[in-house]
């Protein structure tokens, strides 16, 4: 058993049929010595008396808010949550496996630049009685500070018969050094509590590996005289690290119709302009990627050919 | 060329070669990116490699103030990785495929280090840790880790030279 926060405790249980469970001793936070009784949740049934209560925690019915009282007055609470371990593996019932970029990916994180700011998100089908708490650091043995905000519900989607809820959190490294080569990864830890179930999820990454620039901005077309060709120009996204002579991007320019199966024109460039062949009913799209490190491409920025 | 005395390097040449190094480092192991090597433990294997750190003057302001600190750090790293790529970690079993870009990568690391420090000038170089894994699978894992680390190192070096070529070239 360990303390998650004040008056909230996590009991770690090996979860299998007829498991013996864990013996837990609760102590009433009071100077009083006698006349103390214990109850669980809203029930008025007295579970025991005395300053301490010893219980055998085996299942969710044994978890919940234990309260010690004296003469009708509440003295203190202890909330017991369960953390299940099945076949040596901690349960992951609360969050959905996003399976990208690999199986057992529950947390996904992205950064728009090298400033040390990043966003993580996760998915669940649970809609109520759900809380999250996020902590982060750079490195684990001698951790350096990363400050995370509160996790918020950022999107709701319907997937078949189910509703899916996306939560996200923004974090910022306290003393980021955008130009340095990272040697210690960022660690992100998410505590998830659904009713009386506790789970924790972790992710470890370098900012450089989660970089995904915003799409290029201000796409403009200029038809070339006596030619089918069009000069397309764009700018670096505002959110990208500066100076651009140092933090450079490379670009992919593509002309394609509405269907992916249609023919296309495609060219890669380090410049912020390119010449392509525009077709009626097609669009010109441009996306960006770090020029020197193969992290994710941005989403496409598009303009119609006409 | 960047000599210890403090003259400027051939920024444009260094830019071209460092960008080539980036391409080679990724083609040497493009799939490394899909392996979470941090899960494999044995941190010490790549903790000894020289990293370009915050105080090394490789940021745009540091380069403007005095690029020598940064260039020396890059030179150290190039020599370090050049020696690693020539060591039995890469020459031992399992043999690299003959078409592996590691050979080109090795030659390009040497080429860039020579551009930075011509014969006859010497910056101090870092000692190579004695990493000689006994098992072929350990060697394979170590190669992946070294290449992954090299990808990050050459990306910073390429940024430095691109910025230098754009803003510091005479």
């Amino acid at each position: 058993i360990w303390e998650l926060k004040k008056d909230v405790y996590v009991v770690e249980l090996d979860w299998y049929p007829d498991a013996p469970g864990e013996m837990v001793v609760l102590t009433c936070d009071t100077p009083e010595e006698d006349g103390i009784t214990w109850t669980l949740d809203q029930s008025s049934e007295v579970l025991g008396s005395g300053k301490t209560l010893t219980i055998q925690v085996k299942e969710f019915g044994d978890a919940g808010q234990y309260t010690c009282h004296k003469g009708g007055e509440v003295l203190s609470h202890s909330l017991l949550l369960l953390h299940k371990k099945e076949d040596g593996i901690w349960s992951t019932d609360i969050l959905k496996d996003q399976k990208e970029p690999k199986n057992k990916t529950f947390l996904r994180c992205e950064a728009k630049n090298y400033s040390g700011r990043f966003t993580c998100w996760w998915l669940t089908t649970i809609s109520t009685d759900l809380t999250f708490s996020v902590k982060s650091s750079r490195g684990s043995s001698d951790p350096q500070g990363v400050t995370c905000g509160a996790a918020t519900l950022s999107a709701e989607r319907v997937r078949g018969d189910n509703k899916e809820y996306e939560y996200s959190v923004e974090c910022q490294e306290d003393s980021a050094c955008p130009a340095a080569e990272e040697s210690l990864p960022i660690e992100v830890m998410v505590d998830a509590v659904h009713k009386l179930k506790y789970e924790n999820y972790t992710s470890s990454f370098f900012i450089r590996d989660i970089i995904k620039p915003d799409p290029p901005k201000n796409l403009q077309l200029k038809p070339l005289k006596n030619s089918r060709q069009v000069e397309v120009s764009w700018e670096y996204p505002d959110t990208w690290s500066t100076p651009h002579s140092y933090f450079s991007l490379t670009f992919c320019v593509q002309v394609q119709g509405k269907s992916k199966r249609e023919k296309k024109d495609r060219v890669f460039t380090d410049k912020t302009s390119a010449t392509v062949i525009c077709r009626k009913n097609a669009s010109i799209s441009v996306r960006a990627q770090d020029r020197y490190y193969s992290s994710s491409w941005s989403e496409w920025a598009s303009v119609p050919c006409s | 060329r960047a000599v210890p005395g403090g003259s400027s390097p051939a920024w444009t040449q260094c830019q071209q070669l460092s960008q080539k190094l980036c391409t080679l480092a990724w083609s040497a192991h493009p799939l490394v990116g899909h392996m979470d090597l941090r899960e494999e433990g044995d941190e010490e294997t790549t903790n000894d490699v020289p990293h370009i750190q915050c105080g090394d003057g490789c940021d745009p302001q540091g380069l403007r103030d005095n690029s020598q600190f940064c260039l020396q750090r890059i030179h150290q790293g190039l020599i370090f990785y050049e020696k690693l790529l020539g060591s039995d970690i890469f020459t031992g079993e399992p043999s690299l495929l003959p078409d592996s870009p590691v050979g080109q990568l090795h030659a390009s690391l040497l080429g860039l280090s020579q551009l930075l420090q011509p014969e006859g000038h010497h910056w101090e170089t870092q000692q190579i840790p004695s990493l000689s894994p006994s098992q072929p699978w350990q060697r394979l894992l170590l190669r992946f880790k070294i290449l992954r680390s090299l990808q990050a190192f050459v990306a910073v070096a390429a940024r430095v030279f691109a910025h230098g070529a754009a803003t510091l070239s005479p």
Partner: antibody, heavy 118, light 107 residues
Framework: EVQLVQSGAEVKKPGATVKISCKAS????????LHWVRQRPGKGLEWMGW????????EYAPKFQGRVTITADTSTDTGYLELSSLRSEDTAVYYC???????????WGQGTLVTVSS | DIQMTQSPSSVSASVGDRVTITCRAS??????LHWYQQKPGKAPKLLIK???QSISGVPSRFSGSGSGTDFSLTINSLQPEDFATYYC?????????FGGGTKVEIK
């Protein structure tokens, strides 16, 4: 199977015009760009131009501008290359090539030898 | 026009050898570079697109690398059917241009 089949060899006199064809099969003709590339005896490859059969848009290499016309007939799934004012240096194998991507060549015809000789 | 220069113009090699052909562009072309193989009397065949992207059905012994102005095609463990002429082609800008070719001959 995507295939391009070209018309047979031609012998022409200097100053004449040649028109060679390229019949596509195994795909929707207008879904691919069609290019013409030539290769003079013992020499390298030379790109001449392309057509988008869907709308008839064309682009020619400056070297051939004014002498070359590329057309496409979507009713017969056939592309054509017409080269006028022939000279001996135009003796070459002429290839048609196609791709969904404009700038490189995925599928090639077998080639048509054009000999220009007086 | 962008000039493409291939080297060497010919190379003699044996079955099992590793052969590397280089291609240099007269200006930076990012990764807009493609490689073809041509056998005598036959049409060219696409081997690699965009400098390093493999083509379905092409043996994995063919690999490409490079960006900017310098590119290479490597044939690992040359097979009898690989003796042919190899061309690079830039697609950075029109007109599309090819290298002069590299003939891989039997030693």
């Amino acid at each position: 199977e995507v295939q391009l089949v070209q018309s047979g060899a031609e012998v022409k006199k200097p100053g004449a015009t040649v028109k060679i064809s390229c019949k596509a099969s195994g795909y929707t003709f207008s879904d691919y760009y069609l290019h013409w590339v030539r290769q003079r005896p013992g020499k390298g490859l030379e790109w001449m131009g392309w057509i988008d059969p869907e709308n008839g848009d064309t682009e020619y290499a400056p070297k051939f501008q004014g002498r070359v016309t590329i057309t496409a007939d979507t009713s017969t799934d056939t592309g054509y290359l017409e080269l006028s004012s022939l000279r001996s240096e135009d003796t070459a194998v002429y290839y048609c090539a196609a791709n969904k991507e404009l700038r490189y060549f995925d599928v090639w015809g077998q080639g048509t030898l054009v000999t220009v000789s007086s | 026009d962008i000039q493409m220069t291939q080297s060497p113009s010919s190379v003699s090699a044996s079955v099992g050898d590793r052969v590397t052909i280089t291609c240099r562009a007269s200006q930076s072309i990012s990764i807009n570079l493609h490689w073809y193989q041509q056998k005598p009397g036959k049409a060219p065949k696409l081997l690699i697109k965009f400098a390093s992207q493999s083509i379905s059905g092409v043996p994995s012994r063919f690999s490409g690398s490079g960006s900017g102005t310098d590119f290479s095609l490597t044939i690992n463990s040359l097979q009898p059917e690989d003796f042919a002429t190899y061309y690079c082609q830039q697609s950075n800008s029109f007109p599309l241009t090819f290298g002069g070719g590299t003939k891989v001959e039997i030693k």
